[in-house]
């Protein structure tokens, strides 16, 4: 399987929110021993990886905003925790997954990860990530909305592993 | 503060059983991958099992499969460990700790000592 | 099962000193391998994930390298605090496993 990112770059005015989203592309197992643990964090471009390096998105860690499954595979970080620092992150039965930023802030820009993690009972636990960049900007050069730039489709599907 | 405790270790015959319990403190328990790893007296360490959020996913190294059994009670924020058959070379400190899936052992308990031994 | 090796057994070094550690894997585990310390009577901690990334609190005389099968762990100046037993751990695939450790003594 692979991630797609929709779109590389978000330009958005502060005060405003965004919704950044990643697309787990298939063939996807849906067998009943494997399970899919997606998360979200901040990184950098490095020079050898990019999104290799975990850094909290305002104050929360990947562990906080993974997306726990129920028994219908939508999921949501429905905890309190991510919802006081205006954060939800949430995915639905296509595949699709995101993290909504609230009441953006200039120390909000920044490059964004999405993970994917496959375990399966005794394999190799496959991961694949998505990148993206925000710019929140702020002054008489600010767009009044989010403005988003599709990836090329060689940035969306030449997904490698984390 | 990000804790875990374990409890239940001491001294059982071999044959014996024994239930281990982790309680955690300061993280969202319910939605946390939880494992148990163990070092016997002077040895490495060595990963015993693991256990998904909602207690659905189970993994064990092969030497445990048979013999101990994972689970969680997430309304009491505790993880357990129920070993049966036990022997003599399962003598060691049990710890347990939290493994988010694709990183590292992150958060451990300061361990409980397990001796078996008649 | 994937098998980890760590080189040398022991390190006897002094304070101040360069400390290298190394980790083979039998088989290619990308960059999926961890670092932690254990100090006498405690817990071991992560110190470096993903072979090159430092855990939250490390400090920056931890550095970690390699990938496919080697890897490597410096400590680029000794403190007191640092000599312990230091492991290797493969995320890669269940079985997880460990090296058998590497100890770093004071010379």
């Known amino acids: 399987f692979k991630v797609a990112t929709p779109y590389s770059l978000y330009v958005c005015p502060e005060g405003q929110n965004v919704t950044l989203t990643c697309r787990l592309l298939g063939p996807v197992d849906k067998g009943h021993d494997v399970t899919f643990y997606k998360t979200w964090y901040r990184s950098s471009r490095g020079e050898v990886q990019t999104c290799s390096e975990r850094r909290p998105i305002r104050n929360l860690t990947f562990q906080d905003l993974h997306l726990h499954h129920g028994g219908h595979q939508a999921a949501n970080t429905s905890h309190d925790l991510a919802q006081r620092h205006g954060l939800e992150s949430a995915s639905d039965h296509h595949g699709n997954f995101s993290i909504t930023m609230r009441n953006l802030t200039l120390l909000d820009s920044g490059l964004y990860c999405c993970l994917v993690v496959e375990i399966r009972h005794h394999h190799s636990e496959h991961r694949v990530h998505g990148a993206m960049e925000l710019q929140v900007q702020t002054g008489k050069d600010a767009p009044s909305n989010c403005v988003v730039y599709p990836s090329s489709s060689q940035d969306s599907e030449n997904i490698t592993a984390a | 503060e990000v804790q875990l405790l374990e409890s239940g270790g001491g001294l059982v015959q071999p044959g014996g059983s024994l239930r281990l319990s982790c309680a955690a403190s300061?993280?969202?328990?319910?939605?946390?991958?939880m494992s148990w790893v163990r070092q016997a007296p002077g040895k490495g360490l060595e990963w015993v099992s693991r256990?998904?959020?909602?207690?659905?996913?189970?993994d064990y190294s092969p030497s445990f499969q048979d013999r101990f059994t994972i689970s969680r009670d997430n309304s009491k924020n505790t993880l357990y460990l129920q070993m049966n058959s036990l022997r003599a070379e399962d003598t060691a400190v049990y710890y347990c700790?939290?493994?988010?899936?694709?990183?590292?052992?992150?958060?451990w308990g300061q361990g409980t000592l397990v001796t078996v031994s008649s | 099962e994937i098998v980890l090796t760590q080189s040398p057994g022991t390190l006897s070094l002094s304070p101040g000193e360069r400390a290298t550690l190394s980790c083979q894997a039998s088989?290619?585990?990308?960059?999926?391998l961890n670092w932690y310390q254990q100090k006498p009577g405690q817990a071991p901690r992560l110190l470096i994930y993903?072979?090159?990334n430092r855990a939250t609190g490390i400090p920056d005389r931890f550095s970690g390298s390699g990938s496919g099968t080697d890897f490597t762990l410096t400590i680029s100046r000794l403190e007191p605090e640092d000599f312990a037993v230091y492991y290797c751990?493969?995320?890669?695939?269940?079985?997880?496993?460990f090296g058998q450790g590497t100890k770093v003594e004071i010379k």
């Open positions: 700790a939290r493994v988010p899936p694709g990183y590292g052992f992150d958060i």
């Open positions: 300061g993280f969202t328990f319910s939605t946390a991958w």
């Open positions: 256990v998904n959020p909602s207690d659905s996913h189970t």
């Open positions: 088989q290619d585990i990308t960059n999926y």
């Open positions: 993903d072979a090159s």
């Open positions: 751990q493969q995320s890669y695939s269940t079985p997880f496993t």
